[in-house]
């Protein structure tokens, strides 16, 4: 009931709590002398369902049969309406519509750790929409039953607050949950278990790792566990990996030797525990231990390449290049590279440690037979040295690969193809494809890239350090013993017409012809490999079509003669450049008048 109900009563039959779909009878009756003054026959009783009128009646009482009430709480209020006055509230009642509890399902209990307490969970089934009390019972040995009630609205979990002990680990315990509300009760099926079934150990703690003699091959993982733990599983992975290595161990007593760790690698380790081979559940994984394994001496050998440059009649410049070892080969932080240069006939040798670079340049005599050895060193030792004899890589013309081509292959890739050399192709031990950005003037500081290809291959896809709209000088070397042959080509991964034309910087007269000189187009404006230059000229005040001369592009060329100009005629000259994608805009215009005599 609600309100004070001084003027009358509202009664509900059969009950204030009803099963969904049931009918209720609501009666509103006035107490004596509580009707409308003077006109008791004019009493008008009105029944509201929440704020909506559902029935009315003149007299001292009103009966209403109500059906179809929804799940939950519905408020009914009875009011009295008299002539010339506001409605007066008489009384009200709440009706609770719900269902009997369903049988709780999937009752399961767990005790977290040997010192933890037993907690059970279950599925309540559909909402009853009524106050429902859950009672959890646990019966076990020693003729004892524990019982706890849950009065939360949505109760599907209870912690008994008791601790099962391992004195008799095989003793049976039985748990049961009972749900009760005004419309009925229902009990779960009993869940029977032993101590070993429900105790879930705490995750291991205090995890440590030790490397004996700072060696990755002598690695022991240590941890602490609860006293009754029989089984452990270990999982570990390099920190940058998503895949775990898994190891199961029995009676480990808090230690295990790991034999397959890689050196100089950060690993993540986790451990889980279990009390029994086939009973109970695994603990949560422990907190992660992260540790880096010690270094080991490098394995593998450096990939070394070189470039020779003529200086003068007696000297040559040797530039050595090498690639970093992979992480798995370096097996530590590379502290320096050791380069040894040796003259093979005289036995003279010089050794140098290089730090922070993967290249080295020196000047040596053009005479003698020279060899180099390069190795990488970390704190534990050095890799095996890579030895190469310095030779003239392009000396053997018969070893030169044939029909070299370079074609764009998607974004920032170039496919280089060739045919084996004419000389016995089976003599080729390997091909080396080398590429570097094309810089007029042959700048030796430009980074060099290379890859090695097996002798049966006749193509290679180059993608490392390839940028769009840049022209690369590509060489293919065929190596055989102490001989080498090479062929070269220009190539780009992407091209468009150059952004500007060459700048004519001088026009000079020589024996009745002229020599035009120009500045190279800046590399960033070439937009790929240049194929041709065009020189245009026409008489200054003429409307005639210009004449043109097309000359193939060569890296070092920046002048060209023209001998078809008439003397004492003023000409306007300009230049353009072409890539495979098209022609540039005009470069600057220059005027020139040939002074020589007419023929």
């Amino acid at each position: 009931k609600i309100d004070a109900c001084k003027r009358g009563d509202v009664t509900v039959k059969p009950s204030h709590v009803i099963l969904l779909g049931s009918t209720v009878n609501i009666t509103c009756s006035l107490k004596p002398r509580q009707g409308c003054f003077h006109y008791s026959r004019r009493n008008k009783l009105i029944l509201y369902k929440f704020d909506r009128r559902i029935n009315f009646h003149h007299g001292h009482s009103l009966n209403s049969q109500v059906t179809g009430l929804p799940l939950g709480t519905t408020l009914f209020v009875c009011k009295l309406a008299c002539i010339n006055s506001d409605e007066i509230q008489i009384c009200g009642a709440e009706i609770f519509v719900g269902v009997a509890p369903e049988q709780p399902q999937n009752l399961s209990c767990i005790q977290k750790g040997e010192q933890g307490t037993v907690a059970c969970t279950w599925e309540r089934g559909r909402d009853t929409h009524l106050y429902t009390e859950y009672t959890l019972q646990l019966s076990g040995p020693k003729n004892l039953t524990w019982q706890k009630q849950c009065k939360d609205i949505y109760c599907d979990y209870l912690d008994f607050g008791i601790n099962l002990t391992p004195e008799s680990p095989e003793s049976n315990f039985t748990a049961k949950v009972t749900a009760v509300n005004s419309l009925g009760s229902s009990s779960s099926l009993p869940s029977t278990f032993t101590f070993l079934d429900i105790v879930r150990p705490l995750p291991p703690w205090d995890i440590r790792i030790k490397f004996q003699k700072a060696s990755v091959s002598r690695c022991t993982l240590y941890w602490r566990d609860e006293g009754l733990v029989l089984l452990n599983r270990l999982r570990y992975r390099p920190s940058n990996s998503r895949l775990w290595n898994m190891v199961n161990v029995t009676k480990a007593k808090g230690r295990h030797d790991l034999l397959d760790l890689k050196p100089f690698t950060e690993y993540e380790f986790q451990i889980s525990s279990k009390l029994h081979l086939y009973k109970g559940s695994w603990s949560d994984w422990s907190e992660s231990l992260r540790a880096q394994t010690p270094e080991e001496e490098p394995t593998g050998m450096l990939d070394v390449w070189y470039m020779k440059r003529h200086i003068d009649y007696s000297r040559q410049q040797i530039s050595l290049f090498w690639k970093n070892l992979s992480v798995s080969e370096a097996r530590g932080k590379i502290l320096h590279y050791q380069v040894t240069l040796q003259e093979l006939t005289g036995g003279k040798a010089m050794t140098q440690n290089i730090t922070g670079h993967t290249s080295w340049t020196t000047v040596i005599p053009r005479t003698g037979n020279w060899a180099v050895a390069v190795s990488a060193a970390n704190s534990k030792g050095s890799s095996l040295p890579t030895r190469i004899n310095i030779m003239n890589l392009c000396e053997a013309g018969l070893l030169a690969p044939r029909q070299v081509s370079a074609n764009s292959e998607g974004m920032d890739n170039i496919l280089v193809t060739w045919q084996p050399p004419r000389k016995d192709p089976s003599a080729v031990q390997e091909y080396v494809v080398e590429w570097r950005e094309l810089h007029p003037g042959g700048d030796t500081q430009v980074p060099l890239n290379w890859l090695r290809s097996r002798p049966y291959n006749v193509s290679a896809l180059i993608s490392e350090n390839i940028k769009s709209y840049i022209c690369y000088e590509i060489r293919v070397y065929a190596l055989s013993g102490d001989q080498g042959g090479c062929s070269s080509i220009l190539g780009n991964s992407k091209h468009k017409a150059p952004l500007s034309g060459p700048h004519i910087n001088a026009i000079t007269e020589e024996k009745g012809s002229i020599l035009i000189s120009w500045n190279s187009i800046p590399v960033q404006e070439q937009m790929g490999c240049l194929l041709h230059y065009r020189i245009y000229w026409k008489e200054r005040d003429s409307n005639s079509q210009p004449q043109l001369c097309e000359i193939p592009y060569r890296v070092s060329q920046n002048s060209h003669p023209i001998n078809s100009l008439q003397p004492r005629v003023t000409y306007v000259l300009w230049m353009t450049a072409l890539t495979a994608a098209g022609e540039s805009s005009h470069g600057n215009e220059r005027e020139f008048c040939l002074q020589g005599k007419a023929n």
Partner: nanobody
């Protein structure tokens, strides 16, 4: 000084009901374990029912009384009750109230007399057939 005082015993016919009370004074036991034991003539004192004292109180019963006896307490009044329904002649005994100064969480310890630090004088319950 701590005192436990039982009351509510008496002579009842089989099938009848009784409500035993245990009033504690001298200290508050609302957060600690409390229990009822009984002792029939010529037998050892045996555990009947108890409250763990852990959060929300877990009740525990000897299986022989489960479903007929209900243990409860009012922490504010420092009082514990044992409601006994459907009494049987074998329920005839002196009923003792016991209190511990700690929470009992170990499953087996609740029925041991040594778990409890304070005891009442007892109240007689006699069931006639």
């Amino acid at each position: 000084q701590v005192q436990l005082q039982e009351s509510g015993g008496g002579l009842v016919q089989a099938g009848g009901s009784l409500r035993l009370s245990c009033a504690a004074s001298g200290r508050t036991f609302s957060n600690y374990a409390m229990a009822w034991f009984r002792q029939a003539p010529g037998t050892e004192r045996e555990f009947v029912a108890g409250l763990s004292g852990s959060g929300g109180d877990t009740a525990f019963y000897d299986n022989s009384v489960m479903g007929r006896f209900t243990i409860s307490r009012d922490s504010a009044k420092n009082t514990m009750w044992l409601q006994i329904n459907n009494l049987k002649p074998e329920d005839t005994a002196v009923y003792y109230c016991a209190a511990a100064t700690h929470v009992v969480v170990n499953y087996g310890l609740v029925r041991r007399r040594g778990t409890y630090d304070y005891w009442g004088q007892g109240t007689q319950v006699t069931v006639s057939s």
